[in-house]
Amino acid sequence: NIDVCKLGTVTVQPAPVIPLGSAANISCSLNPKQGCSHYPSSNELILLKFVNDVLVENLHGKKVHDHTGHSSTFQVTNLSLGMTLFVCKLNCSNSQKKPPVPVCGVEISVGVAPEPPQNISCVQEGENGTVACSWNSGKVTYLKTNYTLQLSGPNNLTCQKQCFSDNRQNCNRLDLGINLSPDLAESRFIVRVTAINDLGNSSSLPHTFTFLDIVIPLPPWDIRINFLNASGSRGTLQWEDEGQVVLNQLRYQPLNSTSWNMVNATNAKGKYDLRDLRPFTEYEFQISSKLHLSGGSWSNWSESLRTRTPEEEPVGILDIWYMKQDIDYDRQQISLFWKSLNPSEARGKILHYQVTLQEVTKKTTLQNTTRHTSWTRVIPRTGAWTASVSAANSKGASAPTHINIVDLCGTGLLAPHQVSAKSENMDNILVTWQPPKKADSAVREYIVEWRALQPGSITKFPPHWLRIPPDNMSALISENIKPYICYEIRVHALSESQGGCSSIRGDSKHKAPVSGPHITAITEKKERLFISWTHIPFPEQRGCILHYRIYWKERDSTAQPELCEIQYRRSQNSHPISSLQPRVTYVLWMTAVTAAGESPQGNEREFCPQGKAN
């Protein structure tokens, strides 16, 4: 804070604004009858330098001239760009306890002369907008710099506006506030920008333009679409535009897409027919405008119109599969399953499925609609049955997909050979096979079907399946494949009226089981021991169990146990062993083995056979 300079004055030579690299002389003079009261000769004038209100230097050693007790001149050099404050203070040397007293101060600004403004660009937004120009000012001057924008045109048209740049604001754009009308379309206009500050001035090169060069139409507004006869693929896009617009660009895309469809429309007059839309799809539409076919600029894109195209009847065919089980002496339960259509086939919200089961010879027909993707019915075991399913939305139904209900595994000659299942990674399994050896009818297709080897509901947990063309002998299954779960996989070979299948188990990842089987009983029959067990709970199997091992040894023996390895079958829960001595107490236990290794042992049971040794 500088008080009004009561004690004296400070002056700068050559000026308080200097170019970068220049030196300046600062003189500090006391007014008459000011200074130290008793001894004027003890007056000492000092000069302090401040940058951003922080004292950075005492210029005591920079004195170049000194009238003792009256005035001092200091030379300052190497001033940095921007403003520096200098404060002159009076130090009365006989009274060292009093701080120096401020006399006066001065601000010196260091900067550069403005460069000629460049890259002038002018625009008028819309037919009723005003001309605004922007430019590149060049290097920062660090000084207050005034800019003048001048426009001249036909019929002695002149106009100018001013603004300034300093350390708080930047001036590189001005709106002239005048409107160029379309009747001046062919006329030429010239603009020039002049920059001036305390260190110099400069002018841009003249920039020439026409009405068409600078007028950018307003983006179209009030965009809407009308679907012809509620069509899902054809619609008329409509919008409002400025009167002089002759060219439009339309872009549209489904909302989840990454690439736009682009269309140019000449003399569209706010209307354009689109014919390639996808039904029941959320679209985004935008429009841009131009005033001239060859010259001029495109407007900004309009605000987006987001809308969904209407539905159309489903296309494509459903992928159907089924399961057949005999449920009493003359009835079977048919469970039909199908996969949902993908959106491009459904072309709307599927409201229901129409399901038909028909006995071909007797012409018995069962029909129903369901909203689920499965349907179950009990029908007679006799007769040749066929099923069909179609999907319906609000506009209609897809063509029905037919499938013959055959005994899927009934024909041994149609069973595929050498079926194998290999884990590819954490979530898929590669299934390969060879064609049936002696099929008496041609294989129309293969179906690879898989189910988890875990208890499940027939209707709640439908099968997963893939249709494979007859010349392919492999399938990569990944839908609903989880690690550490064993799947039963069937490869079906289907002809027109027969089916054959082969089964294999597979997993995508495996570990050794958590525990071994639990021995529930040991019984002796005809000099053989029967070991009975309960299977390992499914979550503890951790993959496909390949085999079980039954271990036994004499109770107090330290010898290695003997063992018997049996192929795992879920339907088997007992096994005979016949190499134990009578009246010797044995300890028995079981383990389970996956491709990753052997489980810890299950419970131990002691048993002492009574019968005669084998």
């Epitope: 179950t376 499940g456 509901s457 027939i458 709640k460």
Partner: nanobody, 119 residues
């Protein structure tokens, strides 16, 4: 394992009604498909009705319109409401549950409850 227990059978006059009950216990987490069967003296056991997880039901032709199968998942129970009973409906009625493991169907049966319809 799954245990099924039927009740509600008895002697009823032709044209009368009975309600059979079946309660499931044990490892029932995967039992969604429930059935009623019956076996008349000297005849084979036959399917009567079933109900799926999605409450879709299906019936033997001769009982369709007279019998209604329903379920109460909270109570792990399945019911068979039998109206307009006929003498030929006389049989032991069995509750049945089916679940699938891989492609093998496991079945569980109750002990049965006797229904006698007198003329």
């Amino acid at each position: 394992q799954v245990q099924l227990q039927e009740s509600g059978g008895g002697l009823v006059q032709a044209g009368g009604s009975l309600r059979l009950f079946c309660t499931a216990s044990g490892s029932i987490f995967a039992i969604d498909d429930m059935y009623w069967y019956r076996q008349a003296p000297g005849k084979q056991r036959e399917f009567v009705a079933y109900i799926t997880a999605t409450n879709s039901a299906n019936y033997l032709d001769s009982v369709n319109g007279r019998f209604t199968i329903s379920r109460d998942n909270a109570k792990n129970s399945v019911y068979l409401q039998m109206n307009s009973l006929k003498p030929e409906d006389t049989a032991v009625y069995y509750c049945n549950a089916k679940q699938i493991v891989g492609f093998q169907i496991d079945e569980y049966w109750g002990q049965g409850t006797q229904v006698t319809v007198s003329s």
